[in-house]
Interface confidence: medium
């Protein structure tokens, strides 16, 4: 088992909104849960955009999930990752 490296980034979207993207990379096996949570509970599938789980050329995999949120509400959102029985939570950077 190779645990993922998780990285959260933010980018400007429409006025008053930002897009937050959570990327998991260099993990094996390929089964992974990656989702955005608001106040601790997962957003609906429709509120998130998902990348395919793709091989990254090193025998490991990568994927991403993104969502759009209101600027100023960043602290309410975290990226939740679960892989091979381990989980971690990652905040939106300031």
């Amino acid at each position: 088992t190779v645990p993922p490296m998780v990285n959260v980034t933010r980018s400007e979207a429409s006025e008053g909104n930002i897009t937050v993207t959570c990327r998991a990379s260099s993990f094996y096996p390929r089964n992974i849960i990656l989702t955005w949570r608001q106040d601790g509970v997962s957003l609906s599938h429709d509120a998130q955009q998902w990348g395919d789980v793709l091989p990254d050329g090193n025998g490991t995999y990568q994927t991403w999930v993104a969502t759009r949120i209101c600027r100023g509400e960043e602290q309410r959102f975290t990226c939740y990752m679960e892989h091979s029985g381990n989980h971690s939570t990652h905040p939106v950077p300031s």
């Epitope: 949570r37 608001q38 106040d39 601790g40 509970v41 997962s42 957003l43 609906s44 509120a47 602290q75 309410r76 975290t78 989980h87 939570t89 990652h90 905040p91």
Partner: antibody, heavy 122, light 112 residues
Framework: QGQMQQSGAELVKPGASVKLSCKTS????????ISWLKQKPGQSLEWIAW????????SYNQKFTAKAQLTVDTSSSTAYMQFSSLTTEDSAIYYC???????????????WGQGTLVTVSA | DVLMTQTPLSLPVSLGDQASLSCRSS???????????LEWYLQKPGQSPKLLIY???NRFSGVPDRFSGSGSGTDFTLKISRVEAEDLGVYYC?????????FGGGTKVEIK
């Protein structure tokens, strides 16, 4: 399940501040969301704010943004709430409570501290 | 803020009776993820509240099956099929779907 042990009763003067503690044990502190709630004698409950122990991220009930400040100390698995500029309206029992998002996929205040009575009086 | 209104304020019961408690929200409390985060708590005198029901109808661990929750949208009900002495106290409904999260005013279940 774990335990949540709150600090003892406080008698404070109007205008002062008070810092309440909620020491936890028996679960992985950094995985948890912890909320603070207020209950005046004979009345219902009000949610003040939550803090995610893993990151220190917070979300406040707008009514309490100028009054409450939540922090955690991961080394001692303790959550704190500082309440400032106290008035007699702040006299109440304050509870800390742990959310249970993993075990039940969405139960808010699954486990509670015993409460701390704060009395504001001149 | 979402206003949670509980009725009745007081519910006198005889032990062994069925009790029905009502909770109405001022707006729909479906969370943006599709779940309805409506919970019921029981607070006995001098104690912290205890979680009974989460997500409208799910009993929390250790809660007897005489407690059941139902409802949708804005109208919710907690039923106690056969009231026992340990069930007496104040019951609060709570919504966790919209911030700020809010509680109802409570229903006091007491001996008739």
């Amino acid at each position: 399940q774990g335990q949540m042990q709150q600090s003892g009763a406080e008698l404070v003067k109007p205008g002062a501040s008070v810092k309440l503690s909620c020491k936890t044990s028996g679960f992985t502190f950094s995985d948890n969301y912890i909320s603070w709630l207020k209950q005046k004698p004979g009345q219902s409950l009000e949610w003040i704010a939550w803090i995610y122990a893993g990151t220190g991220g917070t979300s406040y009930n707008q009514k309490f943004t100028a009054k409450a400040q939540l922090t955690v100390d991961t080394s001692s698995s303790t959550a704190y709430m500082q309440f400032s500029s106290l008035t007699t309206e702040d006299s109440a029992i304050y509870y800390c409570a742990r959310h249970d998002y993993y075990g039940t996929s969405g139960a808010w205040f699954a486990y509670w501290g015993q409460g701390t009575l704060v009395t504001v009086s001149a | 803020d979402v206003l949670m209104t509980q009725t009745p304020l007081s519910l006198p019961v005889s032990l062994g009776d069925q009790a029905s408690l009502s909770c109405r929200s001022s707006q729909n409390i479906v969370h943006i993820n599709g779940n309805t985060y409506l919970e019921w708590y029981l607070q006995k005198p001098g104690q912290s509240p205890k979680l009974l029901i989460y997500k409208v109808s799910n009993r929390f661990s250790g809660v007897p099956d005489r407690f059941s929750g139902s409802g949708s949208g804005t109208d919710f009900t907690l039923k106690i099929s056969r009231v026992e002495a340990e069930d007496l106290g104040v019951y609060y409904c709570f919504q966790g779907s919209h911030v700020p999260w809010t509680f109802g005013g409570g229903t006091k279940v007491e001996i008739k």
